[in-house]
């Protein structure tokens, strides 16, 4: 039961991570700029995201503009977009793998196969967490580097936006949830009796491989 509880917790965390990741990627709040110059009467805040940028006037009026050409965009922005989308798709794939091997489903009935699928889903979620982390950390690094560069004008300097914090949270949740799913399956034989055992009690014992023997290099 503890194993099932950890699985549920793991998958809940990864689902939360996926939602956070989706919101982080979609929101235009990766970089935030505050223009409050000496001669500027109306202060404005500029939000920059992966897909669009928005200008928020002090009156509260907001105007957003979707980036026009894909090829005209900076390479780092294109890479961040790609990694974000891939991370979300990888996490979705992880969820499908998990559902196939979850304790409460009957897609796969053999216990070892179920354990293997749950372990695989955990690894996939961890990969998704790492993929989410890369563009977030890269963007944060660029913002911080600009902040400490004396030749970058104040008007060009950016602050860390809410999307970055959401991205870090998403990555953390995916890594934690994926890690929990990996931990719930130390090996096929070491898991206590389950309601599936009766069906296979008369068959010859299966020779199962421990997780260290799986060809995990394909997932890293």
């Amino acid at each position: 039961m503890a194993s099932a509880g950890m699985q549920i917790l793991g998958v809940v965390l990864t689902l939360l991570g996926w939602v956070n990741g989706l919101v982080s990627c979609a929101l235009p709040m990766w970089k935030v700029t505050a223009f409050i110059g000496n001669s500027i009467v109306v202060a404005q805040v500029v939000w920059e995201g992966l897909w669009m940028s928005c200008v928020v006037q002090s009156t509260g009026q907001m105007q957003c503009k979707v980036y026009d050409s894909l090829l005209a965009l900076p390479q780092d922005l294109q890479a961040a977009r790609a990694l974000c989308v891939i991370a979300l798709l990888v996490a979705l794939f992880g969820l499908l793998v998990y559902l196939a091997g979850a304790k409460c489903t009957t897609c796969v009935e053999e216990k070892d196969s179920k354990a293997r699928l749950v372990l695989t889903s955990g690894i996939v979620f961890v990969i998704s967490g790492v993929l989410t982390l890369i563009p977030v950390c890269w963007t944060a690094h660029a913002i911080i580097r600009d902040f400490y560069n004396p030749l970058v004008a104040e008007a060009q300097k950016r602050e860390l936006g809410a999307s970055l914090y959401l991205g870090w949270a998403a990555s953390g949740l995916l890594l934690l949830g994926g890690g929990l799913l990996c931990c719930t399956c130390p090996s096929g034989g070491s898991q206590g009796p389950s309601h599936y055992m009766a069906r296979y009690s008369t068959s010859a014992p299966a020779i199962s491989r421990g997780p260290s023997e799986y060809p995990t290099k394909n997932y890293v």
């Epitope: 660029a142 580097r145 560069n149 030749l151 970058v152 004008a153 060009q156």
Partner: antibody, heavy 119, light 107 residues
Amino acid sequence: EVQLVESGGGLVKPGGSLRLSCAASGFTFNDYTMSWVRQAPGKRLEWVVTISSGGGRTYYPDSVKGRFTISRDEAKNSLYLQMNSLRAEDTAVYYCIRGDYRYDAFAYWGQGTLVTVSS
Amino acid sequence: DIQMTQSPSSLSASVGDRVTITCRASENIDSYLAWYQQKPGKSPQLLVYASTLLVDGVPSRFSGSRSGTQFSLTISSLQPEDVARYYCQHYYSIPYTFGSGTKLEIK
């Protein structure tokens, strides 16, 4: 109008010292990053030093680190470059530069002052 | 240190010609590149920053572009007052370095 006027250049022997000054006017001096860039005769421009607004941080290339010191006096609206252990390769026109709120890099340049290091 | 390789070292063109000066960085500098114009006997003047952004007051015939680590300054229609030496400079990281300069003359 932004004005940067350098002074203090001249002839100095190798190993000697010199102090360059830059009088700033036409803007709020303590709001801006200030720098020195030099140009040896017939050579490319070379960044020498930068000081942040307020003077909290200074940045030097290895070629002058430990020999040159930048400072600023907010009360006098002045920038200084103390140059010690001067070498022949330090011979150049030294420009005082102001950063800008909107523009990156070296936005406003003074007319320059010539420093000659020779025995 | 990041090296900035500028070419050509000198260039002669006619009034009205389209002129392009290039600058290559020895490693990635993102868009942290500026272009300066130095007229004979004068101090350098900032023309372009962030590789493509024009300083206010600079004629629109000047433009900057970037392709990876290669940067270009283009004058769409050369004017007599454009006779000068042009320098590129990166400000990606310390030490900030300049290109060797391009001397632009009128034929």
